[in-house]
Amino acid sequence: APVPPGEDSKDVAAPHRQPLTSSERIDKQIRYILDGISALRKETCNKSNMCESSKEALAENNLNLPKMAEKDGCFQSGFNEETCLVKIITGLLEFEVYLEYLQNRFESSEEQARAVQMSTKVLIQFLQKKAKNLDAITTPDPTTNASLLTKLQAQNQWLQDMTTHLILRSFKEFLQSSLRALRQM
């Protein structure tokens, strides 16, 4: 697993560097998670041909993965800091059940999958500190999440592989949009 943000050799070699601001820490955390996702995607793509598959729509019907849309206020046109921050936190909380699903899906990258999951929890905490309107953030229902997890784990092998691929791809895209939006804040 990669070294968590703030613990890389560059930081160690530069003890007089200014401490990271809240925004820099969030940015670094997201990029750390994105690096982890890249490693997981490599294993998924090497193991199966899911990354080139045109049958994604079949599996996508079973999933309700968070997506960024214009109404969420995260794009340059119609940018709204508070609305966008609520969307990012809500989306990350919704992704948690899917990240839990990923935990037993990797052989050589088991540690990496755990690192992505734990780093996402830390990212949510960072963002919650930044948000003013925590009441607007809806937390997913644990019972609904539990039944979704059971349903996903009961899929056949092909659908499980496709689900893994789609979760990683969607999470990467959501994080990249979040990164871009957070840099405007």
Epitope: D27, K28, L34, K67, M68, C74, F75, S77, K172, Q176
Partner: antibody
Framework: EVQLVQSGGGLIQPGGSLRLSCAAS????????MIWVRQAPGKGLEWVSD????????YYADSVKGRFTMSRDISKNTVYLQMNSLRAEDTGVYYC?????????????WGRGTLVTVSS | DIVMTQSPSTLSASVGDRVTITCRAS??????LAWYQQKPGRAPKVLIY???TLESGVPSRFSGSGSGTDFTLTISSLQPEDFATYYC????????FGQGTKLEIK
């Protein structure tokens, strides 16, 4: 071969409209960030706009905001720059390019550029 | 927009010289900075990205450093083919460029 083929430049009167095209081959625009950069005669490079492949989210430089629209047609693997209310200061060579990697860090593939002249 | 300020605008040097070009961002951009070389009538070509990573195929005499707001491009020993215009570009948000540094023969 990975390349970007540009078209659509030309001479246009102030206040007019023009659409530039940039056709990609060797990679898919649906999974890459794309960008337009321009260069006025004898001047430096200026970032115009970029389009993030996810959700087609576009960003514009202040100098073109509200006048230029960057879009894409995934089926044609092509990105466009629709330029309206053109001004003399929009004259220059327009380059289409691809942002390298996901973060993104630099422009690794460039088109050859297309000349836009705004003059009466 | 993030404003990138490059200096000097013009630099006169001789083959074998060591030259340094600087670039300053109007806000912190971490290490999201690239350096390009452009020759007349040609599209720019990337030399350095992420502030200090040398692009594959680019000679090792080119090097980059810096993070946050201040960055430098160094050419350790100028070669005849290095006389061109150099630009920095940030990729933190959007992709604004510095105004360029024309490196000419003294």
């Amino acid at each position: 071969e990975v390349q970007l083929v540009q078209s659509g430049g030309g001479l246009i009167q102030p206040g007019g409209s023009l659409r530039l095209s940039c056709a990609a081959s060797g990679f898919t625009i649906s999974s890459n960030y794309m960008i337009w950069v321009r260069q006025a005669p004898g001047k430096g490079l200026e970032w115009v706009s970029d389009l993030y492949y996810y959700a087609g989210d576009t960003y514009y430089a202040d100098s073109v905001k509200g006048r230029f629209t960057m879009s894409r047609d995934i089926s044609k693997n092509t990105v466009y720059l629709q330029m309206n209310s053109l001004r003399a200061e929009d004259t220059g060579v327009y380059y289409c390019a691809r942002w390298a990697d996901d973060h993104p860090s630099h422009l690794d593939i460039w088109g050859r550029g297309t000349l836009v002249t705004v003059s009466s | 927009d993030i404003v990138m300020t490059q200096s000097p605008s013009t630099l006169s040097a001789s083959v074998g010289d060591r030259v340094t070009i600087t670039c300053r961002a109007s806000q912190g951009i971490s290490s999201w900075l690239a350096w390009y070389q452009q020759k007349p009538g040609r599209a720019p070509k990337v030399l350095i990205y992420k502030a200090s990573t040398l692009e594959s195929g680019v000679p090792s005499r080119f090097s980059g450093s810096g993070s946050g707001t201040d960055f430098t491009l160094t050419i350790s020993s100028l070669q005849p083919e290095d006389f061109a215009t150099y630009y920095c570009q940030q990729s933190w948000l959007g992709g604004s460029f510095g105004q360029g540094t024309k490196l000419e023969i003294k």
